[in-house]
Structures are given as structure tokens and as C-alpha cells.
């Protein structure tokens, strides 16, 4: 069997909302993956599990099942959304994300994703992790790859 290549492309969009009373930030982050099947037979993308970390704390998890079948020598682009919550001991981040004197409120998030594929009863897992910059101050749609390697503003007292 030839390889199944998984490429994490980046954040496609991030939609933000707040609970003012609890100083909680809700970020719905949609990510894009390219999965390439280099085989001469179809493979099934059985599931995608993803999690997002902020400051070494897991702030969101998602799992997609029975996603798609990728034909021989074919590639599919798959979007998946991870709902994240920045709250409790991290709710001081609300003080940064809702600051109105700056226009971009980039925070560093670590995206982890594991893709499970199956073919002929054989299962294979491919994992990727990548640091991305997401604006926690407004709804943002990104050009693919745009959320990588930006200058990040890190809140400080």
C-alpha cells in the first residue's frame, strides 16, 4: 500500500461570542485538511478527532465519524469545526479579547488532529499538530494558510 497523506491547511474561519457575565469566550474554529489517497484503491476516512489547546490547556474537542470515501489517486478537502471555550482560570483572556483600542486580538492556539482511515479492514492513523493564530476579538474568515506565522499580540499586565 502507498501512503495516505494528511495535510493540515489551516484555520478557515473563527466565529467568536462572549458570555459577559462569566467573562467566557466561545470560539467556533473551522479548520481545513487535505487528505490525499496515493493508492489504486479507495480508502475510507473513518473519523477525525481534533482538539485545540490554549496555553497547554485543552479548550475544545471534536470528533467526526464516517466522513467520506476517497477514490484511487484522489484528494479531498475536508473542513471540521471545533467548538472551544476559554473560561474559568483563563477567563482573564476576556480582558484582552474585548479590548477595543486594538483591532486584531491574535491568540496562539495549538491545533491537534488525528485522521483514521481504513482500507481492506486495515486501519491507519495519521496525526498532525500546528500552532495557529486566531483573532478572539471578532469573527474572522482566513485565506487558507493565512493564520500561520503572524505576529501575535500576547496579553501582559
Amino acid at each position: 500500500p502507498r501512503s495516505i497523506d494528511v495535510k493540515y491547511i489551516g484555520v478557515k474561519s473563527a466565529y467568536v461570542s462572549y458570555d459577559v457575565q462569566k467573562r467566557t469566550i466561545y470560539l467556533n474554529i473551522t479548520n481545513t485538511l487535505n487528505i490525499t489517497n496515493n493508492n489504486y484503491y479507495s480508502v475510507e476516512v473513518e473519523n477525525i478527532t481534533a482538539q485545540v489547546q490554549f496555553s497547554k490547556t485543552v479548550i475544545g474537542k471534536a470528533r467526526l465519524n464516517n466522513i467520506t470515501i476517497i477514490g484511487p489517486l484522489d484528494m479531498k478537502q475536508i473542513d471540521y469545526t471545533v467548538p472551544t471555550v476559554i473560561a474559568e482560570e483563563m477567563s482573564y483572556m476576556y480582558d484582552f479579547c474585548t479590548l477595543i483600542s486594538i483591532k486584531v486580538h491574535n491568540i496562539v492556539l495549538m491545533m491537534q488532529v488525528t485522521v483514521t482511515t481504513t482500507y481492506f479492514g486495515h486501519s491507519e492513523q495519521i496525526s498532525q499538530e500546528r500552532y495557529q493564530y486566531v483573532d478572539c476579538g471578532r469573527n474572522t474568515t482566513y485565506q487558507l494558510g493565512q493564520s500561520e506565522y503572524l505576529n501575535v499580540l500576547q496579553p501582559q499586565q
Epitope: 462569566k22 482560570e89 482573564y92 480582558d95 484582552f96 479590548l99 496579553p155 501582559q156
Partner: antibody
């Protein structure tokens, strides 16, 4: 120099409404949240409302919902407090106050205050 | 709502001595390392003036004789040495959640 200049004293009849203004200067109006605070004679302070001047999103003390409405006019850098169905309980000095901030975070303390507007409700 | 209880309601302190004002919150007003309590000074006929923000940070232009401390639920404003011009009413305020509330005030008289 940061300045918050409030409108003059008001004497109004019970049941009437009043609109108080707070004209700001010396800073970028849309870069700072604005608050209004009530102080009844000889009493402590009561926070009424906080507003984001960019989009008009206002967050009210539930006690003042239905009593107070906060609006902003970005073109004149002015915040307005509308008080309706006035009773003697609403007689007080009302202050506008800017929410201070550090370079990269809010602190929610009020660093600059208007001189206050006295509202007296009497028949 | 979070209630802030200030004590004493009034105090008289001799010139050059220390004035200590307490503020107790009905529940914690801290998140992580940040404490959302602020102190104001108000003189008759004037608006309040910010002295201390986030429990212990001195506002720009405020004399160093003012200091704030505390975290969680118990906070203190210290003035040392007290000067004549410090005669005023002092308020604590929290901003941990909505609605923000103020303490009842402490009236400081200079002897």
C-alpha cells in the same frame, strides 16, 4: 488632556424623561468603553451601564433596565444617558466615566470622570 | 450581585499617621493572578478619582503614599503618611462580573 464634559443640572417633573450628555475630548472616543454611575445625595455609588462606543453594545445593571438607556454619537464623541418615568428615587448626581485600560488588557476601573449632572425630580 | 462591605464607615487619623481602610467582598473577585478591585477617592462636590486599580496598581499621578493590597475577598487601602488633603470619602469597587458594585464608603477625617 482627557476631558468628559457633562450637560447642566436638570429639574424635572415626576413621570417625565431626561437626557444627559457627556462630551469627550483628548482621546479616541471609540477606543474606550464608557460607563455611567449614579450617586444619590449623601450615598454611595451605583454602576448603571457600560457601552462599547464602536457598536453601541451596552451592558446594563439589571436594576436600571427599563429606566436608563445609553446611546453614543461617534461623530461628536458624545455619550448620552436617557432616564425615563422619573420618580423622586431617581434624584441624584449622574456621572459618565471612561473605563481605563492597559496596553493590552482591560482593567474595568474608571480613570476619568465627568463633573456630574444633578437631576432633581420634583413636582 | 457581589456585595462590598467597607469598614470602618468613618475614621479620624492624625497627620502623618497611617490610615487603613478595609473592603470585604461577598465572594472572590479574583481570576487567576488578576484581582478586580479598585479604589477611589471622592471629595465633596467633586467626582470620584481613581487611586488604585486591580487591587494594588497605583494610578498615574497618584502619590506613592497610597497603596492597595489583597486578593480573593479581602482588600486594604493604606495611606501613609496621611496628609491634610487626604480628607475625603474612599470607595472600593469590584469589576469581577456584572453588575459592578461599590462599597458603602469610608469617610476619612484628619486630626
Amino acid at each position: 488632556e482627557v476631558r468628559l464634559q457633562q450637560s447642566g443640572p436638570e429639574l424635572v417633573k415626576p413621570g417625565a424623561s431626561v437626557k444627559i450628555s457627556c462630551k469627550t475630548s483628548g482621546y479616541t472616543f471609540t477606543d474606550y468603553y464608557m460607563n455611567w454611575v449614579k450617586q444619590s445625595h449623601g450615598k454611595s455609588l451605583e454602576w448603571i451601564v457600560n457601552i462599547n462606543p464602536n457598536n453601541g453594545d451596552a451592558f446594563y445593571n439589571q436594576k436600571f433596565k427599563g429606566k436608563a438607556t445609553l446611546t453614543v454619537d461617534k461623530s461628536s464623541n458624545t455619550a448620552y444617558l436617557d432616564l425615563r418615568s422619573l420618580t423622586s428615587e431617581d434624584s441624584a448626581v449622574y456621572y459618565c466615566a471612561r473605563e481605563g485600560q492597559l496596553r493590552l488588557r482591560r482593567v474595568y476601573a474608571m480613570d476619568y470622570w465627568g463633573q456630574g449632572t444633578s437631576v432633581t425630580v420634583s413636582s | 450581585d457581589i456585595v462590598l462591605a467597607q469598614s470602618p464607615a468613618s475614621l479620624a487619623v492624625s497627620l502623618g499617621q497611617r490610615a487603613t481602610i478595609s473592603c470585604r467582598a461577598s465572594k472572590s473577585v479574583s481570576i487567576s493572578v488578576y484581582t478586580y478591585v479598585h479604589w477611589y477617592q471622592q471629595k465633596p462636590g467633586q467626582p470620584p478619582k481613581l487611586l488604585i486599580y486591580l487591587a494594588s496598581n497605583l494610578e498615574s499621578g497618584v502619590p506613592a503614599r497610597f497603596s492597595g493590597s489583597g486578593s480573593g475577598t479581602d482588600f486594604t487601602l493604606n495611606i501613609h503618611p496621611v496628609e491634610e488633603e487626604d480628607a475625603a470619602t474612599y470607595y472600593c469597587q469590584h469589576s469581577r462580573e456584572l453588575p459592578y458594585t461599590f462599597g458603602g464608603g469610608t469617610k476619612l477625617e484628619i486630626k
